[in-house]
Interface confidence: medium
């Protein structure tokens, strides 16, 4: 589903996140404490150019409970 | 130029469907999400969901989840919004609007508006 | 209720200076994009910010827009009687039920 060379955007970027972030809901833009200063949001890393399960997940809101 | 054309008003019974259509012109009809937001006489604007017409795919509103569905014909570049089991608060003006898939440039046109009225 | 809170309603005679405020949270506002809608009476609503301060082309720069961590703010300097409407922000909420979000709208009144 997150495959090299994909993109998300718009509405499926939504989509994609509430998926993926469940019930943590989430953020386009990371809070300033965990921002890349270079990052500007998800859109750029994942709608302008292709991105992964796991920088998707560092979008979450609230990080996953480990087991 | 660049529209978004709705179909005419609508009078349905409480219990019915109605179906809205929304034919874009002047612009590539799938490099845009389409929206479609309500608006109740004398309220204001309350979002119902998107569909992406490249793929299809739709994500509604919690509160329409189950009544609505969004569908759309590329090859005639409209959109359509259709609406079931019908009541009374349903009635509204009905918009489309497009939204680029970078979605913080905002929904930059809009259609003219369906008025939907359901009445026994 | 909406999830956005704005004003029901202000005034100001022409020429003068208006701001409307717009409250939300963490899962909106904050960490989203706000658009601002400008809607004439009968009328269809139109595009007048996006990403929080950036105006359509077409727009003049008598419009504004502003965000400040859970609040955004739309100011119009130079007031005209044509700029009577009812004007709405609106951005996502990224909380559990994603969507757009709408603010329940500002009735700006030009005096006289």
């Known amino acids: 589903a997150y495959g090299p060379g994909e993109t998300l955007c718009g509405g499926e970027l939504v989509d994609t996140l509430q998926f993926v972030c469940s019930d943590r809901g989430f953020y386009f833009s990371r809070p300033s404490s965990r921002a890349n200063r270079r990052s500007r949001g998800i859109v750029e890393e994942c709608c302008f150019r292709s991105c992964d399960l796991a920088l998707l997940e560092t979008y979450c809101a609230t990080p996953a409970k480990s087991e | 130029q660049v529209q978004l054309v709705q179909s005419g008003a609508e009078v349905k019974k409480p219990g019915a469907s109605v179906k809205v259509s929304c034919k874009a012109s002047?612009?590539?009809?799938?490099?845009?999400?389409i929206n479609w937001v309500r608006q109740a006489t004398g309220q204001g604007l309350e979002w119902m969901g998107w569909m992406n017409p490249n793929s299809g795919n739709t994500g509604y509103a919690q509160k329409f989840q189950g009544r609505v569905t969004m569908t759309r014909n590329t090859s005639i570049s409209t959109a359509y919004m259709e609406l079931s089991s019908l009541r009374s608060e349903d009635t509204a003006v009905y918009y489309c609007a497009r939204d680029p898939y970078y979605y913080y440039y905002g929904m930059d046109v809009w259609g003219q508006g369906t008025t939907v009225t359901v009445s026994s | 209720q909406s999830v956005l809170t704005q004003p029901p309603s202000v005034s100001a005679a022409p020429g003068q200076k208006v701001t409307i405020s717009c409250s939300g949270s963490s899962s909106n506002i904050e960490n989203n994009h706000v658009s601002w809608y400008q809607q004439l009476p009968g009328t269809a609503p139109k595009l007048l910010i996006y990403?929080?301060?950036k105006r359509p082309s077409g727009i003049p720069d008598r419009f504004s827009g502003s965000k400040s961590g859970t609040s955004a703010t739309l100011g119009i300097t130079g007031l005209q009687t044509g700029d009577e409407a009812d004007y709405y922000c609106?951005?996502?909420?990224?909380?559990?039920?994603?969507?757009?979000?709408f603010g329940g709208g500002t009735k700006l009144t030009v005096l006289g």
């Open positions: 002047g612009y590539t009809f799938t490099s845009y999400d």
């Open positions: 990403d929080n301060n």
């Open positions: 609106e951005t996502w909420d990224t909380s559990l039920s994603a969507g757009r979000v």
